[in-house]
């Protein structure tokens, strides 16, 4: 009887493993091999699958041979017993284009509301994607355990922080990878769980902002004790996509080092033009707060976009106020070529119950004042391009009481 | 602060009407004019925009989408904003959101998405 040749041959690439299936074209012949051969593009000769030779399964690795995963090949398969079958042709591939990418490890670190993420690659050193090792971006779903309600967080790097969680509260998580630039999109890792710790005694430092005042970076942020002592470290932004670098090491500020203020003043140039990472620590001698949350500090776009300065001219019922081109030291104004927009915050003196207007236009009329009452207001301005998407900090408050009744001319 | 209510979403076969209404409730003044719209959110997509309209011009917008299907108008009287949807569709199946900005220069989706006040939502399910 004449063998059949096996049929339905699959290819699956994962990372660096090679696999085949196959169907048995033949289920009643027992005791049957099956045997591949593979071909380089440009190749006339066949040379035997090292891996593949003399299989009694449907399955076989052929990880351990040495492949271009760019370079195209062909691979041919048949049965064996006392004769041999005809050849089954399977497709030509690369198997770079066929490749999926495997799932990432994951490591877990627990804050009391946040978890910090350490993602790798699932294969070490893999030849594969040997020269995109820095390319791969990840996701993650997370869900508190008890609820199950899932938040999908996208194009993060292999160091990522998930903050805003609660204390004592078990989340588990799962990450993929993806190259982009390739439009490939990993498989899962399976599930991590991990409980966030006892609440801190100590919270972090909030809403760190970064201005520029004469040759100076000025760093503020919010705290809710007194009698601290703070400390700011930096880090290369593009560190984070590549943590494995010898230089991922967050560093101090050095003007920034146990100060006792909710602010810190260091020169310009303590930065080159780039892109940074700041966060900020307290301490009140016995215990030390987790780090802030991480902002990302632009040296080139801090220094082109300043707060906006303005003034108001108060009437009974309203406010005008007219916006104006930020000052340099020297208090002569910036030129901004590119489109803004505003963000102007007002409130009552005795309330905290902030309103919120947007406009392109410099001269704004907040209508529907209440008279003889102090109103404050402060600014800032946004890049209208939404992919450039920056802002500058708040401008200082400004506070005006409204004029008595019937002045609104 | 400022409070939007959405209102009128329910399910309703592929072909069929609804029309959502969002009112906005500003406490201790009113600005001159608001920007607002509609979004859509589906399960692990981002919000997309639907519609937005400027209360100080009148002038509108539509994701190409919803053109010819969906109208977005205003009422200033009640400060409320409405969304009728006809010849509705299983892919328009999605939580829909109001949202409102304070401006009378700046009205688009991304206006709106950068800036805006949200309400909480209300589903609307097409089923074929």
């Known amino acids: 009887k004449n063998l059949k040749s096996p049929q339905k041959v699959e290819v699956d690439i994962i990372d660096d493993n090679f696999i085949l299936r196959w169907n048995r074209s033949d289920e009643s012949v027992g005791n049957v091999t099956f045997s591949f051969d593979y071909q380089k593009t440009g190749m006339d000769n066949w040379i035997k699958l090292s891996g593949c030779q003399n299989i009694t399964s449907t399955k076989c690795n052929f990880s351990s041979l040495k492949l271009n995963v760019y370079e195209e090949i062909k691979l041919r398969i048949r049965a064996e017993k006392e004769n041999t079958s005809s050849w089954y042709e399977v497709d030509s591939f690369t198997p770079f284009r066929k490749a999926q990418i495997g799932p990432p490890e994951v490591h877990l670190e627990a804050e009391d509301k946040a978890i910090v993420i350490h993602i790798s690659p699932g294969t070490k050193d893999s030849v594969m994607w040997a020269l995109d090792g820095l390319s791969f971006t990840y996701s993650l779903v997370i869900w508190k355990n008890s609820s199950g309600v899932e938040e999908r967080i996208e194009n993060i790097y292999s160091r990522h922080k998930i903050y805003k969680l609660s204390p004592e509260t078990t989340y588990c998580l799962k990450v993929k990878a993806a190259l982009l630039t390739s439009w490939k999109i990993g498989v899962y890792s399976p599930v991590h769980c991990i409980k966030t710790t006892v609440e801190n005694e100590l919270p972090p430092p909030e809403n760190i902002e970064v201005s520029v005042q004469n040759q100076n970076y000025v760093l503020k942020w919010d705290y809710t004790y007194a009698n601290m002592t703070f400390q700011v470290q930096w880090l290369h932004a593009f560190l984070k996509r590549n943590p494995g670098n010898h230089l991922y090491k967050w560093k101090q500020i050095p003007d920034c080092e146990n100060v006792k203020t909710t602010q810190c003043v260091f020169p310009q140039n303590v930065f080159q033009k780039g892109i940074y990472l700041l966060r900020v620590q307290a301490s009140d001698g016995n215990n030390t707060s987790f780090w802030s949350e991480e902002i990302k500090f632009d040296t080139e776009i801090q220094a082109f976009l300043l707060p906006p300065v303005f003034n108001i001219r108060s009437l009974s019922d309203s406010f005008h106020i007219y916006i104006g081109a930020p000052k340099q030291s020297g208090n002569t104004p910036v030129i901004q070529d590119y489109p803004l927009i505003y963000e102007i915050i007002f409130w009552e003196n005795t309330s905290n119950a902030e309103r919120k207007i947007i406009e392109k236009k410099t001269d704004v009329t907040v209508p529907n004042l209440k008279p003889l009452t102090v109103y404050c207001v402060k600014a800032r301005a946004h890049t209208m391009d939404e992919k450039l998407n920056k802002s500058s900090v708040f401008s200082d408050a400004v506070c005006e009481k409204t004029k008595p009744g019937n002045t609104s001319k | 602060q400022v409070q939007l209510q959405e209102s009128g979403g329910g399910s309703v076969q592929a072909g069929g009407s609804l029309r959502l209404s969002c009112a906005c409730e500003a406490s201790r003044y009113t600005y001159s004019s608001n920007c607002m719209g509609w979004f859509r959110q589906t399960p692990g997509k981002e919000r997309e925009g639907v519609a937005a309209?400027?209360?100080?011009?009148?002038?509108?917008y539509y994701a190409d989408s919803v053109k010819g299907r969906f109208t977005i108008s205003q009422d200033n009287a009640k400060n409320t904003v409405y969304l009728q949807m006809n010849s509705l569709k299983p892919e328009d199946t999605a939580m829909y959101y109001c949202?409102?900005?304070?401006?009378?220069?700046?009205?688009?989706?991304?206006?709106?998405?950068?800036?805006?006040?949200w309400g909480q939502g209300t589903q609307v399910t097409v089923s074929s």
């Open positions: 309209i400027s209360t100080a011009s009148g002038s509108t």
């Open positions: 949202a409102v900005v304070e401006s009378s220069t700046y009205c688009t989706p991304d206006a709106l998405k950068r800036f805006g006040y």
